[in-house]
């Protein structure tokens, strides 16, 4: 059997660190057997069998010029093997971050904090940490660890499915290369890393007969699970074309009627989502959708209770967003039963 421990990585490759002494091991001989060493492609002897170093070649203060293939052979000239030297650095602790687009699953991504220059893999696992009592800071013994399954095709991401929203998790990402391993531990709670995907299907439509109005509607992101206990609230922004500043409102449901649009101008609209109890952070903005108020006369309006925008239709104060409103709502896949009072008034 070979006297050379096989480091993780391709066969026949041995590893060292620049600036350090490197020992190469002749794989096809018995440990301690004296061998001769050559650089592949160079006939001069690098180290003879009388060196006292047995089956090893010692390169003091290796540098990039030492990288390449070496030939070792026994006393009688038999080929002991070929060894390729690759230089690089031991792993450093990877940079790890985790995010959740819903309240049941989360993913963690990582990247090296230093480039090692060597073949590298990552070991990913997690433990669940459960609080013993509501007032207690003590934690029960960790459960797990379980593997955090990695994405195929080498994407630097792993996904934990079926996570518990109220639990804390400890993520372990270990960077491994032939010169060692380095671990980053990260404590995460789903509540703090929750960031929904942006709402989908945003549509902006004119309201016939109302040159200052636009109706925006959207749906929950497809990634948000279909269960009624975790709802989303929304934030909507709009602005006329060429206008630099956004107006912001917090709709109560899955649509909003803008009443202070600029007549005749196309408007950009976008929406963002967040857990309705303010866990985590707002989603990124949806792609912008555009709409232009309709042209036409304004019918006489009947004053109505609970109207969303009661100010007269004058140029909007775009820098003063409407105050936030309560955003509890039924499950998104159900109908939004909020009456559009203004609509009723208009029809009357």
């Amino acid at each position: 059997s070979s006297p050379c421990p096989q480091a993780w990585g391709p066969p026949g490759v041995q590893y060292g660190q620049p600036g350090r002494s490197v020992k190469l091991c002749c794989p096809g001989v018995t440990a301690g057997d004296p061998v001769s060493w050559f650089r592949d492609g160079e006939p001069k002897l690098l180290q003879g069998p009388d060196s006292g170093l047995g089956h090893e070649l010692v390169l003091a203060q290796a540098d990039s010029t030492d990288e390449g293939t070496y030939i070792c052979q026994t006393l009688d000239g038999a080929l002991g093997g070929t060894v390729t030297l690759q230089l690089g650095y031991p792993p450093a602790r990877p940079v790890v971050s985790c995010q959740a687009a819903d309240y049941e699953n989360f993913s963690c991504t990582w990247s090296p904090s230093q480039i090692s220059g060597l073949p590298t893999r990552y070991l990913t696992s997690y433990r669940k940490k459960t609080v013993l009592g509501a007032d207690s800071q003590r934690r029960s013994p960790s459960t797990g660890p379980w593997p955090c399954p990695q994405d195929p095709l080498g994407a630097a991401r792993c996904v934990v499915h079926g996570a518990e929203f109220w639990s804390q998790y400890r993520i372990n990402v270990t960077e491994v290369n032939p010169l060692g391993a380095s671990t980053r531990l990260l404590d995460v709670s789903l509540q703090s890393i929750l960031r929904p995907d942006p709402p989908q299907g945003l549509r902006v439509e004119s309201v016939p007969g109302y040159p200052r109005r636009l109706r925006a509607s959207w749906t929950y992101p497809a990634s948000w699970p279909c269960q009624p206990h975790f709802l989303l609230k929304f934030r909507l922004q709009y602005r006329p074309a060429q206008h630099p500043a956004w107006s912001t409102v917090e709709p109560a449901g899955l649509e909003e009627v803008i009443t202070d649009a600029v007549a005749g101008l196309p408007h950009a609209v976008r929406v963002s989502a967040r857990d309705f109890l303010d866990a985590g952070t707002w989603s990124t903005w949806s792609p912008e959708a555009w709409g232009t108020p309709s042209t036409g006369t304004i019918p006489k309006e009947i004053p109505a209770w609970g109207q969303l925008h009661t100010q007269p239709e004058v140029e909007p104060q775009v820098d003063s967003p409407a105050p936030p409103r309560p955003s509890l709502q039924p499950h998104p896949r159900l109908l939004d039963h909020r009456d559009s009072v203004e609509q009723v008034a208009v029809l009357a």
Partner: antibody, heavy 117, light 107 residues
Framework: QVQLQQPGAELVRPGSSVKLSCKAS????????MHWLKQRPVQGLEWIGN????????HYNQKFKDKATLTVDKSSSTAYMQLNSLTSEDSAVYYC??????????WGQGTLVTVSA | DIVLTQSPATLSMTPGDSVSLSCRAS??????LHWYQQKSHESPRLLIK???QSISGIPSRFSGSGSGTDFTLSFNSVETEDFGVYFC?????????FGAGTKLELK
């Protein structure tokens, strides 16, 4: 014991090719480099090249790069050297020698190649 | 290519004499120098490797020395079976090259 068997002589026509053989026995063929050398009375010994029988990796003397081609047949433990476009300058004794990377430890008896019309 | 110059070209000796053969390299080759003996109508055989390392089966009267550019093959007492041609060979760089040889003949 180590033996390298080479044919005693080859008579060849100018412009033609010849493939010299070297059958090895008495050792593990793929563990050692096989070298080929040329000897003429005035010019002395010249190294043509070597081949690693395990992977057929070769090193050639640039002088012979277009003249000689080294191959091996592991199944019969035989090394070959093909010489092409022969001229009178190629008349010589050709040796195969088992060695390490750069030394010639065991030599065949040599093949006398005579290039003559 | 590295050129090896051997001297003398011919050396006439009688059995029992001590002999020194010289090989000079055109550039420094450290200790990457080897010696071969070729008797009449025979193939060469390796005598000394890496300037001074002995070879199994070779009589101990053969010894080598030198480093850099100047090398010597010595035998402390020539025997009749030692007559023949002696070649030096370098393995410092490709192509591997030989000296032209020193012929050791009977006086």
């Amino acid at each position: 014991q180590v033996q390298l068997q080479q044919p005693g002589a080859e008579l060849v026509r100018p412009g033609s090719s010849v493939k010299l053989s070297c059958k090895a026995s008495g050792y593990t063929f793929t563990n050692y480099w096989m070298h080929w050398l040329k000897q003429r009375p005035v010019q002395g010994l010249e190294w043509i090249g070597n081949i690693g029988p395990s992977d057929s990796k070769t090193h050639y003397n640039q002088k012979f790069k277009d003249k000689a081609t080294l191959t091996v047949d592991k199944s019969s433990s035989t090394a070959y050297m093909q010489l092409n476009s022969l001229t009178s300058e190629d008349s010589a004794v050709y040796y195969c020698a088992r060695g390490d990377y750069v030394l010639f430890t065991y030599w065949g008896q040599g093949t006398l190649v005579t290039v003559s019309a | 290519d590295i050129v090896l110059t051997q001297s003398p070209a011919t050396l006439s000796m009688t059995p029992g004499d001590s002999v020194s053969l010289s090989c000079r390299a055109s550039q420094s080759i450290s200790n990457n120098l080897h010696w071969y003996q070729q008797k009449s109508h025979e193939s060469p055989r390796l005598l000394i490797k890496y300037a001074s390392q002995s070879i199994s089966g070779i009589p101990s009267r053969f010894s080598g020395s030198g480093s850099g550019t100047d090398f010597t093959l010595s035998f402390n007492s020539v025997e009749t079976e030692d007559f023949g041609v002696y070649f030096c060979q370098q393995s410092y760089s490709w192509p591997l090259t030989f000296g032209a040889g020193t012929k050791l003949e009977l006086k």
